[in-house]
Interface confidence: medium
């Protein structure tokens, strides 16, 4: 048994243009409240019971009224932690959903107005008894900063809160800093201390002196983002000695995608294609109405106001998937012609054209010989995106500027002797042979 604790640090407009000034309009005073929902990491719970580990609701925050023209202050937040008690073992890997709600006051006829401003979801690895983990999540134009931890309630101890540790009548039997544990009176437990330097944000330990990394981090102290690792193998657990990923099972082994999602390997990890109504890294988040904000990357949610009608996400350019969760690989359509290199810049598509071609899609074949001169009577031949000179006899090279030795290639067969001549070459054939190259 234990308690998951969530501390909201701030909620407000995220960085970048188009961010709202404040969740409260100047018309009506409002206040915020938060809801957290927890599920075991590999949960396949449907929406009927989406918070298998528990859920909690914050108190209402202080009332805030936006002052027109005044700089937007930090929004007042509800006091205290959101606490989700759990009865059984802490699962270690868990999914969370944090919702930010606005309650507008002032128009008391029929009660206040509520709005679900933001909904963030994620899957994390967390050992009970560890330090606070900090996180930043963005939902649309909003940014939520928070910390969380899981702690055991006495007498439970350990990273899963499954061991019992009861104070004994004679605690002095254990050395300094140690505490006696059940079931053996002479068994003493040391406080869990991770390897020195182990990142408090990205690492944790289940045994003293170790440093195990959260998803996305590697290195002996969990300080290296996986995406910047210089290792060759794209899969496997983190090696404590090199910080590199060592070969292991495939990321799709055992299908990590919940709720009927299908798994496909990517160069560094895996990708779940979720059925409608589910989303998240592993399709672990169930959401079936537009109120849940299931459309990512600025997708517009239509329909699905009631539970029996599916929502549809209308995705902005560059995104696809039932939840607009996948960036379209626009280069896979091979839009660049004539061998041009495709570059997807996110906001636009660019084609880098081969020499001799131009245009947005390299569709224009340039005159390769325009402005190109071949020396010494050579003629320009167009083709293949580059000019080529057909040189007069006795000359060679790209532009026919080099004097060529026609005898260099030993053109005279059967022992014939080659003589260079202003008009080309002459073969003096050995007895018994004839022809321009002594070939007969």
């Amino acid at each position: 048994a234990g308690v998951f604790e969530l501390q909201i640090h701030s909620f407000g407009p995220g960085p970048g243009p188009g961010a709202p000034r404040s969740p409260c309009s100047a018309r009506l005073p409002c206040r915020l409240f938060f809801r957290v929902c927890l599920k075991p990491g590999l949960s396949e719970e449907a929406a009927e019971s989406p918070c298998a580990l528990g859920a909690a609701l914050s108190a209402r925050g202080p009332v805030y009224t936006e002052q027109p023209g005044a700089p937007a202050p930090d929004l007042p937040l509800p006091d205290g932690l959101l606490q989700v008690p759990f009865r059984d073992a802490w699962p270690g890997t868990f999914s969370f959903i944090i919702e930010t709600w606005r309650e507008e006051l002032g128009d008391q006829i029929g009660g206040p107005a509520w709005s679900l401003l933001a909904r963030v979801a994620g899957r994390r690895r967390l050992a009970a008894g560890g330090p606070w983990a900090r996180d930043i999540q963005r939902a649309g134009a909003w940014e939520l900063r928070f910390s969380y931890r899981a702690r055991c309630e006495p007498p439970a101890v350990g990273t899963a809160c499954t061991r019992l540790c009861r104070p004994r009548s004679a605690p002095s039997r254990c050395g300094p800093g140690l505490r006696p544990c059940a079931p053996l009176e002479d068994e003493c437990e040391a406080p869990l201390v991770c390897r020195a330097g182990c990142s408090p944000e990205h690492g944790f330990c289940e045994q003293p002196g170790e440093c195990r990394c959260l998803e996305g981090w590697t290195g002996p102290l969990c300080t290296v983002p996986v995406s910047t690792s210089s290792c060759l193998s794209p899969r496997g657990p983190s090696s404590a000695t090199t910080g590199c990923l060592v070969p292991g099972p495939g990321p799709c082994d055992g299908n990590p995608c919940a709720n009927g999602g299908s798994c496909s390997e990517t160069p560094r990890s895996f990708e779940c294609t979720c059925p409608r109504g589910f989303y998240g890294l592993r399709c672990e988040v169930s959401g079936v109405t537009c109120a849940d904000g299931p459309c990512f990357n600025g997708g517009l949610c239509v329909g699905g106001a009631d539970p029996d009608s599916a929502y549809i996400c209308h995705c902005p350019p560059g995104f696809q998937g039932s939840n607009c969760e996948k960036r379209v690989d626009r280069c896979s359509l091979q839009p660049c012609r004539n061998g041009g290199l495709c570059l997807d810049l996110g906001h636009a598509l660019r084609c880098r054209c081969r020499a001799g071609f131009a245009g947005p899609r390299c569709e224009h074949d340039l005159d390769d010989c325009a402005g190109r001169a071949c020396a010494n009577g050579g003629t320009c031949v167009e083709g293949g995106g580059a000019h080529r000179c057909s040189c007069a006899l006795g000359f060679g090279g790209r532009d026919c500027r080099e004097r060529a030795d026609p005898c260099a290639a030993r053109p005279c067969a059967h022992g014939g002797r080659c003589y260079a001549h202003f008009s080309g070459l002459v073969c003096a054939c050995a007895p018994g042979y004839m022809g321009a190259r002594c070939e007969f």
């Epitope: 809801r35 929902c37 449907a46 929406a47 009927e48 989406p50 918070c51 859920a55 909690a56 609701l57 709600w101 507008e104 029929g110 009660g111 206040p112 107005a113 509520w114 709005s115 679900l116 401003l117 933001a118 909904r119 649309g140 109504g277 169930s286 079936v288 109405t289 537009c290 109120a291 849940d292 904000g293 949610c301 106001a305 009631d306 539970p307 029996d308």
Partner: nanobody, 129 residues
Framework: EVQLAESGGGSVQAGGSLRLSCAAS????????MGWFRQAPAKEREGVAT????????YYADSVKGRFTISQDNEKNTVYLQMNSLKPEDTAMYYC??????????????????????WGQGTQVTVSS
């Protein structure tokens, strides 16, 4: 077809208690919110209480705070309204409803009928003095 069926209404003396039930059927997923409304003769329908599908958000009309408790059982797809210390002015037809915000940032009124898409047929509660 989504269907909501209320039960548990009846006649009771002032100060008594009743427990209303609302069984939902016809859809796989829970609605975002389930609410109880009531309508007395010649009066407008008014919100009494609402609860979200995860059982964490509840809201009550001022007139019933401290006396009524809304709860839900997800396994049974049922929402309950426990009514204690009943008063004659609580006499009305009580309706169960399902609904919720349509989109993010949509203003949604938990105790107003337009915020709900589905309605039951109602169950009568009569409190005599």
């Amino acid at each position: 077809e989504v269907q909501l069926a209320e039960s548990g209404g009846g006649s009771v003396q002032a100060g008594g208690s009743l427990r209303l039930s609302c069984a939902a059927s016809g859809y796989t997923y829970r609605s975002n919110f389930m609410g109880w409304f009531r309508q007395a003769p010649a009066k407008e329908r008014e919100g009494v209480a609402t609860i979200d599908s995860r059982g964490t958000i509840t809201y009550y009309a001022d007139s019933v705070k401290g006396r009524f408790t809304i709860s839900q059982d997800n396994e049974k797809n049922t929402v309950y309204l426990q009514m204690n210390s009943l008063k004659p002015e609580d006499t009305a037809m009580y309706y169960c409803a399902a609904g919720g915000p349509r989109t993010n940032d949509d203003r949604w009124y938990p105790l107003r009928p337009p915020g709900y898409n589905y309605w039951g047929q109602g169950t009568q509660v009569t409190v005599s003095s």
